[in-house]
């Protein structure tokens, strides 16, 4: 950076090198060049010479004034015009930054994704600060009072093996940067209450062409949690509103859910689950598409590997991978 150059004098910023965005700031340059009484002092911002708001303070010092400085980062340097020197002589340089103090972190959430071995904590950091902002996640046992702190710049994964102070904890987040420090409210958690079951996945769908055509959705999860509540939402791809069906589920076998749908329409399905009575849901599963047959069964679009079985009596769709969910982060 600009701060690594050899200086023949010095440059400083008031009120500080890192300051609140929108402030008025002054940049001072003081020359200390051998055998040079500077004729003129020049300021450069990001390599471009500044023309206005420069005041000569004395023989060796000048000030550059900025009103309402809004740039997150800038490289400043200053030079001197010395008699008998053809080129300007570099005095010194400095990187400056503007931004905001952190907001109070809120919406602190900690979950344990089944089989992950981690407790994942996230929060709403608030408005963009533009400057380096660090977060310290505090985890304090309600049983032993032992506290652990984790430094991060975003979310944090904490190994559940390191949580040795029992099952009950307080979690809070401290945000700090050069302009200020704020702290969230404390979140009380019980490790058994924040587990999110292993992801539920829709594996295939088939429409049976009975008197009233019936679509069966096959879905499963590797969870070992006994009491699981799930929601499946579905809609025609042309619709805005979802229909939601609720299930109390036992994943000892593949789930089969029946739907009576309109013929010759492309539908999209998603599923999510939670441990019954607990707070947090899985994110919605990947989008699963299925096109119902016309009254006479037909093969559906190859793009989603739809196949036809049972001598024309069924139309089936197989999941081929992961199209992202429209709100994959929904754990509330």
């Amino acid at each position: 950076g600009i701060t690594n150059i050899n200086c023949s004098g010095h440059i400083w910023v008031e009120p500080a090198t890192i300051f609140k965005m929108g402030m008025n700031i002054s940049i001072y340059c003081q020359a200390a060049i051998k055998n040079c009484q500077p004729r003129k002092l020049h300021f450069y911002k990001n390599g471009i010479k500044e023309r206005f708001q420069i005041t000569r303070i004395n023989k060796t010092t000048a000030r550059l004034w900025y009103k309402n400085f809004l740039e997150p980062h800038a490289s400043m340097y200053c030079t001197a015009e010395c008699p008998k020197h053809f080129q300007e002589t570099l005095i010194c340089g400095k990187d400056i930054s503007s931004g905001y103090p952190p907001d109070i972190p809120d919406e602190v959430t900690c979950v344990i994704y089944e089989y992950s071995g981690n407790m994942t904590c996230t929060w709403n950091a608030g408005k963009l600060t533009y400057i380096d902002t660090k977060y310290v996640v505090h985890v304090k046992s309600l049983e032993t009072e032992e506290e652990q702190q984790y430094l991060t710049s975003s979310y944090i994964n904490i190994s559940t093996d390191s949580l040795q102070g029992g099952k009950k904890y307080l979690v809070w987040v401290q945000a700090a940067n050069a302009l200020g420090m704020e702290e969230s409210k404390q979140l009380q958690i019980h490790l058994d209450d924040i587990v999110i079951p292993s992801a539920a996945v829709i594996s295939r769908a088939e429409t049976i062409n009975a008197t009233v055509p019936k679509t069966i959705i096959y879905w499963d999860s590797q969870t070992t949690i006994e009491k699981v509540s799930c929601e499946m939402r579905y809609k025609a791809t042309t619709n805005q509103t979802w229909n939601v069906k609720e299930f109390d589920t036992n994943f000892t076998y593949v789930q089969q859910s029946e739907f009576y749908l309109e013929p010759n329409i492309k539908y999209v399905f998603q599923v999510r689950c939670q441990e019954t009575g607990k707070r947090y849901w899985q994110p919605w599963s990947s989008l699963f598409f299925h096109k119902t047959p016309e009254t006479v069964p037909q093969v559906t679009s190859k793009a989603f590997q739809h196949d036809t079985w049972n001598s024309g009596l069924t139309v089936a769709s197989i999941s081929t991978g992961h199209l992202t969910s429209d709100n994959r982060g929904d754990i509330g």
């Epitope: 310290v136 505090h138 304090k140 309600l142 032993t144 009072e145 032992e146 506290e147 652990q148 702190q149 984790y150 430094l151 307080l170 809070w172 401290q174 420090m181 704020e182 702290e183 404390q186 009380q188």
Partner: antibody, heavy 121, light 112 residues
Amino acid sequence: EVQLVESGGGLVQPGGSLRLSCAASGIDFNSNYYMCWVRQAPGKGLEWVSCIYVGSHVNTYYANWAKGRFTISRDNSKNTLYLQMNSLRAEDTAVYYCATSGSSVLYFKFWGQGTLVTVSS
Amino acid sequence: DIVMTQSPLSLPVTPGEPASISCQASENIYSFLAWYLQKPGQSPQLLIYSASKLAAGVPDRFSGSGSGTDFTLKISRVEAEDVGVYYCQQTNRYSNPDIYNVFGQGTKVEIK
């Protein structure tokens, strides 16, 4: 058994500086721990000054009135806690105690004997 | 800022009789409260932590109770050696940007 021994107290003029030390033994400096400074003005109650948390990173905490004037630090190689006190005032006259439980809790099983700081002209 | 308020500030006691000191926090501190006794000319010593747990070597005539904002230290039968100043301390968190003190003002216990 944890032992804490403070030193560095004495008479200092208003506006002056002083650095207090607390030599600790019996603490596992490789684990997470809090170490703190607490002071007591003559005839007054206990007043929290500052704490340092040492774990995978180091974090420092100060009473509102101590921010900007006092700095807590530690030297693990010397098993020593420090309190650098600048811009001292007459109201900073007190016995300064070093305190810890030797772990990452904020109650104090162990206290030093205290070191007296007198700020006077 | 969490403020700790003790009452009474002075407590004359009769040896053999029970005594009780109250400590109130200005916000929820769960069970994160400690009690100390400072005998004349000595450093403070920990009596109770986590609101109700007896520190090592402390006689069982001392007991603590409470959670949230209201806490009590009880001495079942006061002895002459129990005189001194008792302090409560919140041990919840010191990372809050606006903490002035974490101790109560102290309760002076003396023999009648």
